[in-house]
């Protein structure tokens, strides 16, 4: 926070994890820094060690409990501090009053599987991971399919405006290798963002029957 621009961004996975990134132009790579979490209405405090992810950027995960435990609610405020060691003392570099359900980023969907595949279509299902029961059905998904000779960035996005943990891909080419990814986002939260993309699921359409299109 001394020289250059500084940025401290955190997201809550809706259950028991707050992931933070702190970036600081001109900061020393070998400085020892931590994120401290101090909730306003909970008995616990939590700390994580910031580790370098790039030249001027550090990240860490505040593990608040077991993965599926509901550690925070929409009324909680958690004061988050970046503290860096300077000699024998700790110095506060960045601070924010973090509202967890205004800053959501869920875990990537998991357990992707092909339910049924044909020559021109494929039905795929997935599961959401560590998502709060508070959302009920208030989630949306984006999906994309990687076709041969294209990149993920070129893949058109398919939007599912409801909590639907499956999709039927149509107009596929027979006997062709594809990959599929999906991501999830709660409808709640001013600064909420998409989860990371799921691990790609590779599948192959069935070959066309001989003598047919």
């Amino acid at each position: 926070a001394v020289n250059g621009t500084s940025r401290f961004t955190c997201f809550y996975n809706s259950r028991a994890n707050i992931s933070c990134v702190w970036s600081q132009d001109g900061a020393l790579q070998d400085t020892s820094c931590q994120v401290h979490a101090w909730p306003d209405r909970r008995r616990w405090n939590q700390t994580c060690e910031l580790l370098p992810v790039s030249q001027a950027s550090w990240a860490c995960n505040l593990i608040l409990g077991t993965p599926d435990s509901q550690k925070l609610t929409a009324v909680d405020i958690v004061t988050l501090r970046v503290m860096c060691r300077e000699g024998v003392r700790w110095r506060m570099m960045a601070i924010q009053d973090f509202k967890p359900f205004e800053n959501l980023r869920l875990m990537a969907p998991i357990s992707l599987q092909v339910v049924h595949v044909e020559t021109h279509r494929c039905n795929i299902s997935w599961k959401i991971s560590q998502a709060s029961h508070y959302f009920e059905r208030h989630l949306e998904f984006e999906a994309r399919t990687l076709s041969p000779g294209h990149t993920w960035e070129e893949a058109p996005l398919m939007t599912l405006k409801q909590k639907q943990e499956w999709i039927c891909l149509e107009t596929l080419t027979p006997d062709t290798q594809y990959e599929f990814q999906v991501r999830v986002k709660p409808l709640q939260g001013e600064f909420t963002t998409w989860s990371p993309w799921s691990q790609p699921l590779a599948f192959r359409t069935k070959p066309a029957a001989l003598g047919k299109d």
């Epitope: 926070a1 001394v2 500084s6 940025r7 401290f8 101090w38 306003d40 004061t79 501090r81 970046v82 700790w90 110095r91 506060m92 570099m93 960045a94 601070i95 924010q96 009053d97």
Partner: nanobody
Framework: QLQLVESGGGLVQTGTSLRLSCAAS????????MGWFRQFPGKEREFVAA????????VYVDSVKGRFTISRDNAKSTVYLQMNSLKPEDTAVYYC???????????????????WGQGTQVTVSS
């Protein structure tokens, strides 16, 4: 480095007003939030009030809400504490403080502030 110098303290009667000033010099462009703490004899310093870099956010300890007002003039690199309806229990040494850390909270602690003035005595007699 950054220096903070308080002024405006003194001896006043219960129910009257006083305005503390704190002038910053040195690397003032580094300053983000500024605030006031106070220390009673034999006690730890306690938070009184803080103000964000642009003056848009302020926070006060419950015991001074509605009586004290914090403000700042960035052009003069000065922060003020207007103290009205003073009480004998407001008697303390008042310290100006500043941080170059980014961000804002409503829950400031002593350790959050890296820069401190020498303090100015405020005595409220009954």
């Amino acid at each position: 480095q950054l220096q903070l110098v308080e002024s405006g303290g003194g001896l006043v009667q219960t129910g009257t007003s006083l305005r503390l000033s704190c002038a910053a010099s040195g690397h003032t462009s580094r300053i983000n939030a500024m605030g006031w703490f106070r220390q009673f004899p034999g006690k730890e310093r306690e938070f009184v009030a803080a103000i964000s870099r642009n003056g848009g956010s302020t926070v006060y300890v419950d015991s001074v809400k509605g009586r004290f007002t914090i403000s700042r003039d960035n052009a003069k690199s000065t922060v003020y504490l207007q103290m009205n309806s003073l009480k004998p229990e407001d008697t303390a040494v008042y310290y100006c403080t500043a941080t170059d850390a980014v961000g804002w909270t409503t829950r400031w602690m002593t350790a959050d502030f890296g820069f401190w003035g020498q303090g100015t005595q405020v005595t409220v007699s009954s």
